[in-house]
């Protein structure tokens, strides 16, 4: 006879799966906060900074009541993919001033990538419909100046921090509904 069958596959507890995703998101939120503070210390921001290529905010107090797990995970994954792309672009094209944020910016990129893989895994474990592969995004234009790179960094880290902050709250809320 062939090898004995392996142990029965235990279906994962969705709350536990979501818990570990919340932990990762919280951890990345803390990393982003520290890096944004570091950026502000080195290059104080004068007013607000926007970048048209960044995703628009997906969550607010009013949206919390109608949250559904598939929608939240799909949107969060799409937004974080965009931020990952922007962080990669920042490291490549941000100019010499932003090299002072290494290796922290590289660590942030790696952790963002890890959270994205965790979200992908969570979606497959919960048997949620997988989003279609992302269409190739148009390349981001290099900053027009060193100051342009710094302004972009403020916008990217600020936007990522806000997205992660709402993500933690949304995921915590969804956990209670499972």
């Amino acid at each position: 006879p062939g090898p004995p069958p392996g142990p029965p596959r235990v279906s994962p507890d969705p709350r536990a799966e979501l818990d570990s995703t919340v932990l990762l998101t919280r951890s990345l939120l803390a990393d982003t906060r520290q890096l944004a503070a570091q950026l502000r210390d080195k290059f104080p921001a004068d007013g607000d900074h926007n970048l048209d290529s960044l995703p628009t905010l997906a969550m607010s107090a009013g949206a919390l009541g109608a949250l559904q797990l598939p929608g939240v995970l799909t949107r969060l994954r799409a937004d974080l993919l965009s931020y990952l792309r922007h962080v990669q672009w920042l490291r490549r094209a941000g100019g010499s001033s932003l090299k002072t944020l290494e290796p922290e910016l590289g660590t942030l990129q790696a952790r963002l990538d890890r959270l994205l893989r965790r979200l992908q895994l969570l979606m497959s474990r919960l048997a949620l419909p997988q989003p279609p592969p992302d269409p190739p995004a148009p390349p981001l234009a290099p900053p027009s100046s060193a100051w342009g790179g710094i302004r972009a960094a403020h916008a990217i880290l600020g936007g990522l921090h806000l997205t992660l902050d709402w993500a933690v709250r949304g995921l915590l809320l969804l956990k209670t509904r499972l």
């Epitope: 921001a45 921090h161 902050d165």
Partner: antibody, heavy 117, light 110 residues
Amino acid sequence: EVQLLESGGGLVQPGGSLRLSCAASGFTFSHYDMNWLRQAPGKGLEWVGVISYDASNKFYADFVKGRFTISRDNSKNTLYLQMNSLRAEDTAVYYCARTPGSHFDYWGQGTLVTVSS
Amino acid sequence: QSVLTQPPSASGTPGQRVTISCSGSSSNIGNNAVNWYQQLPGTAPKLLIYYDDLLPSGVPDRFSGSKSGTSASLAISGLRSEDEADYYCSAWDDSLNGVVFGGGTKLTVL
């Protein structure tokens, strides 16, 4: 630097109205939900209500429902609190505060509202 | 009567560690993030801890937060005279559909 500056407080008679403003600067106002909170003299903090970043949703504490209205003008980076049918127990320092998720990460310095005849 | 329950006062001597408790229910602390605010005399409140145990930038790591079930606590180690203030816990409440606070704890540094 994030700054929130309340104005419009003062002395008003019971049953009267008052409109508070909160001028925001140093951040992208239109990205953040905004709140009003209050603190009666010598008492604790009390949440009044929240308005979503795009003004599409508002939530209020039970004690102000139907009397207070929160609004915002994103083009002017300003938050408002319209207070009607004021009572003596509404006497408090009123604060505006920014919400990035579940918490209030920046607060204004507050404006005092006194309801008395 | 506040929805979240805190001791009205706490005290300690410089260098000591003090803990402030905050208890609630499943509709607030049990299901939602707990935040802590510090209010120095005559000033506006300031965020001290968010999402149960995260520190905003600029807050010294002498401050820490924790949560278990429907209770949370704030710990301050290496107490300093400038820590003398009112401390408030807060959370969203699913039943009330709003933010609730504890009554505040007045911390005295002896």
